[in-house]
């Protein structure tokens, strides 16, 4: 960076090298060049010479003033016009940054994705800070009072093997950067309550020729959790509103869900599950498209990504569910 150059003087920023976006700032340049009394001192921002708001302070120092500085990052350097020198002499350079102090982290969420071996904690960091912001995730056992801290710049994966202090914990997040520090509210968790089942995947769909044609969606999960509640949402691709079916599911076999759909229309399906009665849902599965036929022939669609563990499983039963209409987005 610009800060690694050999300096013949000194450049500094007031109030600081990292400052709040929108502030007025002063950049000072002081030459210290052998046998050079600078006739002029010049400032450059990102390689472009500044022409205004430069004040000579004394024989070796000049100040550049910026009002309402809004750039997240800039490389500044200054030069001297030395008599008897044919070109400007570099004095020094500095990278400057503007941004915001962190917001209070909120919506702290910790989940354990089945088979992952990790507890994943996320949070809403708030508005963009533009500057390097670090987060310390505090995990305190409510049984042993032991506290562990994890440093990260976004989310954190904590090995469940390291959670030796029982099942109940307090989790909170501290956000800090050069401009400030904030701390979230404490989240109380029980490890058994935050498990999210292994992802549910739609494998294929078929429309059966019958008096009233029906579409069967085949879907499955590798979860070992016994009591699982799922939702499948679907809509015509031209629609805004989702329809949602709810299921109480036992994944000892591939699930089949029946739908009575309009002919010759492209539909999109997604599924998600949670451990029954718990708080957190899986994210919605990837989009599965199926176009219903114009008339009677049987049509089969397959998922874009057809995992091998879905192959060769026999259909053991058909699940049915309750139909609701859903305008909700993804719920975590």
């Amino acid at each position: 960076g610009i800060t690694n150059i050999n300096c013949s003087g000194h450049i500094w920023v007031e109030p600081a090298t990292i400052f709040k976006m929108g502030m007025n700032i002063s950049i000072y340049c002081q030459a210290a060049i052998k046998n050079c009394q600078p006739r002029k001192l010049h400032f450059y921002k990102n390689g472009i010479k500044e022409r205004f708001q430069i004040t000579r302070i004394n024989k070796t120092t000049a100040r550049l003033w910026y009002k309402n500085f809004l750039e997240p990052h800039a490389s500044m350097y200054c030069t001297a016009e030395c008599p008897k020198h044919f070109q400007e002499t570099l004095i020094c350079g500095k990278d400057i940054s503007s941004g915001y102090p962190p917001d209070i982290p909120d919506e702290v969420t910790c989940v354990i994705y089945e088979y992952s071996g990790n507890m994943t904690c996320t949070w809403n960091a708030g508005k963009l800070t533009y500057i390097d912001t670090k987060y310390v995730v505090h995990v305190k056992s409510l049984e042993t009072e032991e506290e562990q801290q994890y440093l990260t710049s976004s989310y954190i994966n904590i090995s469940t093997d390291s959670l030796q202090g029982g099942k109940k914990y307090l989790v909170w997040v501290q956000a800090a950067n050069a401009l400030g520090m904030e701390e979230s509210k404490q989240l109380q968790i029980h490890l058994d309550d935050i498990v999210i089942p292994s992802a549910a995947v739609i494998s294929r769909a078929e429309t059966i020729n019958a008096t009233v044609p029906k579409t069967i969606i085949y879907w499955d999960s590798q979860t070992t959790i016994e009591k699982v509640s799922c939702e499948m949402r679907y809509k015509a691709t031209t629609n805004q509103t989702w329809n949602v079916k709810e299921f109480d599911t036992n994944f000892t076999y591939v699930q089949q869900s029946e739908f009575y759909l309009e002919p010759n229309i492209k539909y999109v399906f997604q599924v998600r599950c949670q451990e029954t009665g718990k708080r957190y849902w899986q994210p919605w599965s990837s989009l599965f498209f199926h176009k219903t036929p114009e008339t009677v022939p049987q049509v089969t669609s397959k998922a874009f990504q057809h995992d091998t563990w879905n192959s060769g499983l026999t259909v053991a039963s058909i699940s049915t569910g309750h139909l609701t209409s859903d305008n909700r987005g993804d719920i975590g």
Epitope: Q30, K34, R39, R56, K59, C82, P83, K84
Partner: antibody
């Protein structure tokens, strides 16, 4: 172009002090390093002191230390040379000059006569 | 302090002559050496800086050479206006020091 205009001849008694002025034009005093050089009658040039831009300070020749000060008035772009406790051997022409590494602009010189 | 020794002290020459003045420093100067011309009752005038660079407006018959401790001012083809006293000066370290001067007079 730098132009340096100095004050006129001064006559002083031994033990007195003298203040020679050097008015700068073409540039501001903040853009120039002013040095002072003297020349006794029939003798060579002798550097007395001046501003060192590398270290940002005024440096004096050892033999004048304690007797010389080099104040500046940036509001009028005038540099001064104060020499106290004058002796007869201080009789000389005193030049202000700008150090643009080396001395490239010179005042016309100010004659100081020290005589009882 | 760095001592600057010029030779000769006086030099008699005629118009058109090639004149050489030498200056020796008591320690190496990294080429921070200047040459001045001074006429009676006038301020010195810069001729050469950084040992060999010609000051703007100075006639090309003046040239400087040398490095380290030994330096030379040469006037190739002396003109009537060149009869004056010449000084070398080091500006490598403080205090700045001058040679004692070389007077170039008419033979």
């Amino acid at each position: 172009q730098v132009h340096l205009v100095q004050s006129g001849t001064e006559v002083r008694k031994p033990g007195a002090s003298v203040k020679v002025s050097c008015k700068v034009s073409g540039y501001t005093l903040n853009e120039l390093a002013i040095h002072w050089v003297r020349q006794a009658p029939g003798k060579g040039l002798e550097w007395m002191g001046g501003f060192d831009p590398e270290h940002g300070e005024i440096i004096y020749a050892q033999r004048f230390q304690g007797r010389i000060t080099l104040p500046e008035d940036t509001s009028t772009d005038t540099a001064y040379m104060d020499l106290v406790n004058l002796r007869s051997e201080d009789t000389a022409v005193y030049f202000c000059t700008t150090e643009a590494a080396p001395f490239d602009y010179w005042g016309q010189g100010s004659l100081v006569i020290v005589s009882s | 302090d760095i001592q600057m020794t010029q030779s000769p002290s006086t030099l008699s020459a005629s118009v058109g002559d090639r004149v050489t003045i030498t200056c020796r420093a008591s320690q190496s100067l990294s080429n921070w050496l200047a040459w001045y011309q001074q006429k009676p009752g006038k301020a010195p005038k810069l001729l050469i800086y950084k040992a060999s660079s010609l000051e703007s407006g100075v006639p090309s018959r003046f040239s400087g050479s040398g490095s380290g401790t030994d330096f030379t001012l040469t006037i190739s083809g002396l003109q009537p206006d060149d009869f004056a006293t010449y000084y070398c000066q080091q500006y490598d370290i403080y205090p700045r020091t001058f040679g004692q001067g070389t007077k170039v007079e008419i033979k």
